[in-house]
């Protein structure tokens, strides 16, 4: 089992985050297009 040092505020330290969001219509305050990581 994991020891506490493997976690930072409940998040696994080594886990990759989502990709940076894409704002294709950047000149408007639009919703982002998010593309999930392929593991």
């Amino acid at each position: 089992s994991y020891s506490m040092e493997h976690f930072r505020w409940g998040k696994p330290v080594g886990k990759k985050r989502r990709p940076v969001k894409v704002y294709p219509n950047g000149a408007e305050d639009e919703s982002a297009e998010a593309f999930p990581l392929e593991f």
């Epitope: 990709p19 894409v22 704002y23 950047g26 305050d29 982002a32 593309f35």
Partner: antibody, heavy 113, light 112 residues
Framework: EVQLVESGGGLVQPGGSLRLSCAAS????????ILWVRQAPGKGLESIGM???????YYATSAKGRFTISRDNSKNTLYLQMNSLRAEDTAVYYC???????WGQGTLVTVSS | DIQMTQSPSTLSASVGDRVTITCQAS??????LAWYQQKPGKAPKLLIY???TLASGVPSRFSGSGSGTEFTLTISSLQPDDFATYYC??????????????FGGGTKVEIK
């Protein structure tokens, strides 16, 4: 108008510190992923760090331990605190709204004695 | 950190030519790849994201392909306004020990 405006660049001696600001207008900075990218004179683009919309920050190896990204939501502004500056940090520094066409105009940082 | 290797670094071409630029990632990044165009003294302009999706207002002569570690930007018929420097960018996720955002070294497309 949606835009980012950087400020705070200038001439600094090796080993010195500088804080760059990235002021957002037309959108709420805390709702978006923001990158810091630099470009040395005549060279290519280099991503040095980012802050996700939730406030988490990540840094390239070249910036880790020396650079810190923070955010002031009340001022709708992001900051890049740069310490222990070296000659190779000389560049135009841009803040960027995620992956998009919203880039600041850039601010030049020159590290020289 | 992710390493992005772009080739060629310089490309001499004529108006009307078909131009291909390649980008290789040091690790698989799925389709989290963008292409930017930069002209001297200007901020980069987004051309393509998600490896193959054209950004708003970008002419259809630009196209992108690839996934995983190998990517390509193609200009089907080079126009005078296309002489510029092109960069690929990975924008996959980061972790405490890995930074997944990186640019290729750039490809300068110049007039032959």
């Amino acid at each position: 108008e949606v835009q980012l405006v950087e400020s705070g660049g200038g001439l600094v001696q090796p080993g010195g510190s500088l804080r760059l600001s990235c002021a957002a207008s037309g959108f709420t900075v805390s709702a978006y992923d923001i990158l810091w990218v630099r470009q040395a004179p005549g060279k290519g683009l280099e991503s040095i760090g980012m802050m996700y919309d939730d406030g988490d920050t990540y840094y390239a190896t070249s910036a880790k331990g020396r650079f810190t990204i923070s955010r002031d939501n009340s001022k709708n502004t992001l900051y890049l605190q740069m310490n222990s500056l070296r000659a190779e940090d000389t560049a135009v520094y841009y803040c960027v709204k995620g992956v998009s066409n919203i880039w600041g105009q850039g601010t030049l940082v020159t590290v020289s004695s | 950190d992710i390493q992005m290797t772009q080739s060629p670094s310089t490309l001499s071409a004529s108006v009307g030519d078909r131009v291909t630029i390649t980008c290789q990632a040091s690790q698989s990044i799925g389709s989290s790849l963008a292409w930017y165009q930069q002209k001297p003294g200007k901020a980069p302009k987004l051309l393509i994201y998600s490896a193959s999706t054209l950004a708003s207002g970008v002419p259809s002569r630009f196209s992108g392909s690839g996934s995983g570690t190998e990517f390509t930007l193609t200009i089907s018929s080079l126009q005078p306004d296309d002489f510029a420097t092109y960069y690929c960018q990975s924008y996959e996720g980061s972790s405490s020990s890995y930074y997944g955002i990186g640019f290729g070294g750039g490809t300068k497309v110049e007039i032959k």
